[in-house]
Amino acid sequence: RQQWELQGDRRCQSQLERANLRPCEQHLMQKIQRDEDSYGRDPYSPSQDPYSPSQDPDRRDPYSPSPYDRRGAGSSQHQERCCNELNEFENNQRCMCEALQQIMENQSDRLQGRQQEQQFKRELRNLPQQCGLRAPQRCDLEVESGGRDRY
């Protein structure tokens, strides 16, 4: 957890208490389950990893959002509601990070195994961009944040 959190951000705390992040959790869980069903294997091959290599140092611009994907009626409804909730955090990157960390923590017990946990984290990292929002900088979604062994 970051230092700013220890200092206490009352405005963020009240925002988090007001927010209903359940649709985000539902959307992400449905997405990873749907991907597992579709592929019958790990859908996140290295070529789909958000940290995959590129020769352009400015390639993954956190502020060039993509419009959100509406595949899957139930999931798109959850996604729309999720994006509306996350939109409340747009002007507070720290708070956006807190919200995403909260989603991760809320779902961590429901994720089965390391592979599903990694898939959930990858989808969670993509969520702000899918919603047309800025992805936070300096935001650790993992209690034990791990990168790839080779990079």
Epitope: Q2, R134, R138, E142, S145
Partner: antibody, heavy 121, light 108 residues
């Protein structure tokens, strides 16, 4: 392309305050955090702190707490580093460096040319 | 606070492989980035745990991590690879950026 242009060299007496500027261009100023890193002669890189120009939030290295102030001016896309209570040990090249990455990925692709600050009586 | 430890210097023969270590507690769990600095110049990122490598850097540069050590590997070393190399991480516990002490690489 991204450009970070820093102010020129400065000489200060011990106990004084110095203010270094870093004017940016080639990207949306409020979208990326700016960091300050210094390098004393013959020494390694030392992180001083960062500022988020969008929110004004700052994070300073423990060592500099209490005598460093980072500010930004969105009207001309410039960030400033102010260091007070200078001692000869603060003699160094001061760099501004723009952040890159999201979430736990955080590093610097774009750097200023450096500003030499000399503290001498 | 989180500390990154690098050997102060190393010498390498041209055409061989150089491995520059960066040690820290459980560093394999961190995102590690590497910079090269030449005299009188600002540092340049050579390998990052984000995009593999920056566009101006040859693919002879690569990074790896295991346990308490991150390693920058330069294959087929050339005279132009001389410089000071620094590892860097962002430490989420303190919300601080941390640099290693640097390794001066000399090509024999």
């Amino acid at each position: 392309q991204v450009q970070l242009v820093q102010s020129g060299p400065d000489v200060r007496k011990p106990g004084a305050t110095v203010k270094v500027s870093c004017q940016t261009s080639g990207y949306r100023f409020t979208d990326y955090e700016m960091n300050w890193v210094r390098q004393a002669p013959g020494q390694g890189l030392e992180w001083i702190g960062l500022i988020n120009p969008h929110s004004g939030d700052t994070a300073y290295a423990q060592k500099f707490q209490g005598r460093v102030t980072m500010t930004s001016d969105t009207s001309d896309s410039t960030v400033y580093l102010e260091l007070s209570g200078l001692t000869p040990d603060d003699t160094a090249v001061y760099y501004c460096a723009r952040s890159q990455g999201t979430f736990e990925v955080y590093y610097f692709v774009s750097w200023g040319q450096g500003s030499l600050v000399t503290v001498s009586s | 606070s989180y500390v990154l430890t690098q050997p102060p210097s190393m010498s390498v023969a041209p055409g061989t492989t150089a491995s520059i270590p960066c040690g820290a507690n459980n560093i394999a769990k961190k995102r590690v980035h590497w910079y090269r600095q030449k005299p009188g110049q600002a540092p340049v990122v050579v390998v990052s745990d984000d995009e593999d490598r920056s566009s101006v850097i040859p693919d002879r540069f690569s990074g790896s991590k295991s346990g308490d050590t991150a390693t920058l590997t330069i294959s087929r070393v050339e005279a132009g690879d001389e410089g000071d190399y620094y590892c860097q991480v962002w430490d989420s516990k303190t919300d601080h950026v941390v640099f290693g002490g640097g390794t001066k690489v000399t090509v024999l």
